[in-house]
Interface confidence: medium
Amino acid sequence: FERTRSLQDPCSNCPAGTFCDNNRNQICSPCPPNSFSSAGGQRTCDICRQCKGVFRTRKECSSTSNAECDCTPGFHCLGAGCSMCEQDCKQGQELTKKGCKDCCFGTFNDQKRGICRPWTNCSLDGKSVLVNGTKERDVVCGPSPADLSPGASSVTPPAPAREPGHSPQ
């Protein structure tokens, strides 16, 4: 709805959910269905985003805010505002141009998205492998023989997994 109009710019007082209709003496007209204006002073309302196909509606469009989409089961969001949906893979796999492929030996992926990452190299920290890695899990590093003095910790957690370069938000 229109508020008291400014003498300088009548459009500045049109609130969210309306547009300043130049064809009608700069009156604040409500946004038509399937359109919105999220800020005041708009000269037009924007068309609502439609969540079709692999996208599904997470939040309906209203007169003041756009619809928000996410992805149907088996897919996950990529990009700002879920601009793309990417196919899920199983743990122990990564998505390639030819579809989901098992992680190569020496790499793992513990998520349904992202890329396979190399197992932690325990020896770089002077540790030994306590539990072997798999396609789905990183190795668990244990103490080196020199660490086996009384009171020493017997297990250190694996290095934190790095986020893949194209991980979703």
């Epitope: 709805f1 959910g17 009608r24 009156i27 604040c28 007209s29 003041t64």
Partner: antibody, heavy 116, light 107 residues
Framework: QVQLVQSGSELKKPGASVKVSCKAS????????MHWVRQAPGQGLEWMGW????????TYADDFKGRFVFSLDTSVSTAYLQISSLKAEDTAVYYC?????????WGQGTLVTVSS | DIQMTQSPSTLSASVGDRVTITCKAS??????VAWYQQKSGKAPKLLIY???IRHTGVPSRFSGSGSGTEFTLTISSLQPDDFATYYC?????????FGGGTKVEIK
């Protein structure tokens, strides 16, 4: 589901004040403005004004400037209507209504009776 | 302020009848008109917005039409649940104004 639940009926004496509450649930309170509508006994609907639930800024219809105040407590998703210096002619049912492309959901109404 | 004039003010009809209520605006309000139904002692319910779009859950027997200054609410086959008062409202500009109401009663 969207629900607006208003406070119960009030019986007040002329000159007193009353505060009517409207508790919203089932949606994000600050995404939609809240409007207030009055209906006197046996009469039609009269728009009183609205409040921007994001900024708290109220807008009042000409006939409701002065003694009528809209306010919010966003922490409990509640809008309020306060009427001061009550008069007999304020006797009416007061409704809150969420606004999207129209007043799409309404509270059940609060009857305010002003009588000496 | 924009005046919304509804007619008739009272309408007697029977179950199964086709009912038409009209609303005239004192000036052009584009398609920014809504229709509400109110039963005795209850809050109004939105039926139609933007002149012709049914609100969620509203039965298809309710339809709206018109633009500019003349608007119509039609109930194609009146049901027992439809005996109520109906209001039009322009929401083109502030203040949004309601029509005086049309009471649909049993003949």
């Amino acid at each position: 589901q969207v629900q607006l639940v208003q406070s119960g009926s009030e019986l007040k004496k002329p000159g007193a004040s009353v505060k009517v509450s409207c508790k919203a649930s089932g949606y994000t309170f600050t995404d939609y403005s809240m409007h207030w509508v009055r209906q006197a006994p046996g009469q039609g609907l009269e728009w009183m004004g609205w409040i921007n639930t994001e900024t708290g800024e109220p807008t009042y219809a000409d006939d409701f400037k002065g003694r009528f105040v809209f306010s919010l407590d966003t922490s409990v998703s509640t809008a309020y209507l306060q009427i001061s210096s009550l008069k007999a002619e304020d006797t009416a049912v007061y409704y809150c209504a969420r606004y999207d492309y129209a007043m799409d959901y309404w509270g059940q109404g609060t009857l305010v009776t002003v009588s000496s | 302020d924009i005046q919304m004039t509804q007619s008739p003010s009272t309408l007697s009809a029977s179950v199964g009848d086709r009912v038409t209520i009209t609303c005239k605006a004192s000036q052009d309000v584009s398609s920014a008109v809504a229709w509400y139904q109110q039963k005795s002692g209850k809050a109004p319910k939105l039926l139609i917005y933007w002149a012709s779009i049914r609100h969620t859950g509203v039965p298809s027997r309710f339809s709206g039409s018109g633009s500019g200054t003349e608007f119509t609410l039609t109930i194609s086959s009146l049901q027992p649940d439809d005996f109520a008062t109906y209001y039009c409202q322009q929401r083109y500009t502030t203040p949004p104004t309601f029509g005086g109401g049309t009471k649909v009663e049993i003949k």
